[in-house]
């Protein structure tokens, strides 16, 4: 079993979770990657995935989730914008590698979203929020459906303590309606 740890982020409603998942360039640069939520007692659920093969620096948006895969950096950047209290939960990045089971990227993210004013006077997030107001072009993409021959055990408890979970215990579900969002730097 691989020992997994969690990194906790406590954010306010309306803020943006912005994390990066590091991966091995040579092995996974063009592999399809996904952002999942792990709910207690359930299999990991895929919320968004990159295209297959994954395109370099090409934003994919699913609702309030934006994925960008930077092949030259070996990083998958995940942003969840306009956070809501109900977004609270345990998340992880995984890499699809059929026919093998998905490869999990460390560490898991424990997101806690609370109500309340997120900023101080004069604070803003406009420079990034404007990006997502650009009229998107829509495309269809499917995240693979994996069925594991192994039994999926209960998801880790809601704590920030280290947890041990075998990599093989990851299952994914379909996600449709992937949206491409052009980003201008």
């Amino acid at each position: 079993a691989t020992k997994l740890t969690e990194e906790k982020y406590e954010l306010k409603e309306g803020q943006t979770l912005d994390v990066k998942c590091d991966y091995t360039l040579e092995k996974f640069a063009s592999s399809q990657k996904a952002w999942q939520i792990i709910r207690d007692g359930e299999m990991p659920k895929t919320l968004a995935c990159t295209e297959r093969p994954s395109k370099n620096s090409h934003p994919v948006q699913v609702g309030r989730i934006i994925l960008e895969d930077y092949h030259d950096h070996g990083l998958l950047r995940v942003r969840m914008v306009n956070l809501q209290v109900e977004d609270s939960g345990l998340y992880q990045c995984v890499i699809y590698q059929p026919p093998k089971e998905p490869h999990m990227l460390f560490d898991r993210i424990r997101l806690v979203v609370t109500k309340g004013f997120s900023g101080t006077p004069g604070s803003n997030e406009n420079s990034t929020q404007n990006v997502y107001k650009i009229p998107p072009t829509t495309t269809k993409a499917l995240c693979p459906l994996y069925t594991s021959p192994r039994t999926v055990t209960q998801a880790p408890p809601k704590s920030t303590a280290d947890v041990s979970t075998p990599d093989s215990e990851i299952n994914l579900t379909n996600v449709t309606d992937i949206i491409r969002v052009p980003v201008f730097n």
Partner: antibody, heavy 119, light 108 residues
């Protein structure tokens, strides 16, 4: 317990070289990005260089680009900083720091090693 | 490069009082901001990250707020061990990762 221990600092003349080492323990070294951060005497903190864990990607501050090289030996749980063409303004305490898996913020730091560049 | 500006440079506060430190980014960094504490002769210590999340083992009297370009570190009731220099750092987008110039919290 996470521990980071720097070594290799000392006095060197301008134009000289030094190699800093940072031996780590208490976490799975290969999984995490590591950075070098320096602090000139009586001054603030300046990020110097970063090396990612899985990807091995490297990044440098403009002030050291082309002169410093960051590397790591995952089998020895050690991070390195090769410093060439040293300048007086490179004089500082050099800290190695472990980063979060998910972002470049520094959750564990070494005690630092002093590099003095002087003629 | 994102420039981080802290104010004030020095803050004189009596023990038990509240201290409010400010950090401003030259462009939006969302919530990608951390605060560190450094005491003389010691390495920095992570206090707050993600603008408002307390790091492991950090007392509840330390709190962070803000988003975008304006951030605040508040120490609700200063203890003797809190007198130190405090730095903010942005970790938005790509390197270079930049720090503010620091705020020294001294005994009034």
């Amino acid at each position: 317990e996470v521990q980071l221990l720097e070594s290799g600092g000392g006095m060197v003349q301008p134009g000289g070289s030094l190699r800093l080492s940072c031996a780590v323990s208490g976490f799975t070294f290969s999984r995490y990005a590591m950075s070098w951060v320096r602090q000139a005497p009586g001054k603030g903190l300046e990020w110097v260089s970063e090396m990612r864990g899985s990807s091995g990607s490297t990044y440098y501050a403009d002030s050291v680009k082309g002169r410093f090289t960051i590397s790591r030996d995952n089998s020895k749980n050690t991070l390195y900083l090769q410093m060439n063409s040293l300048r007086v303004e490179d004089t500082a305490i050099y800290y190695c720091a472990k980063e979060f898996s998910s972002n470049s913020l520094f959750d564990y730091w070494g005690q630092g090693t002093l590099v003095t560049v002087s003629s | 490069e994102i420039v981080m500006t802290q104010s004030p440079a020095t803050l004189s506060v009596s023990p038990g009082e509240r201290a409010t430190l400010s950090c401003r980014a030259s462009q939006s960094v969302n919530a990608n901001l951390a605060w560190y504490q450094q005491k003389p002769g010691q390495a920095p210590r992570l206090l707050i990250y993600g603008a408002s999340t307390r790091a492991t083992g950090i007392p509840a009297r330390f709190s962070g707020s803000g988003s975008g370009t304006e951030f605040t570190l508040t120490i609700s009731s200063l203890q003797s061990e809190d007198f130190a220099v405090y730095y903010c750092q942005q970790f938005y987008n790509w390197p270079p990762w930049t720090f503010g110039q620091g705020t020294k919290v001294e005994i009034k």
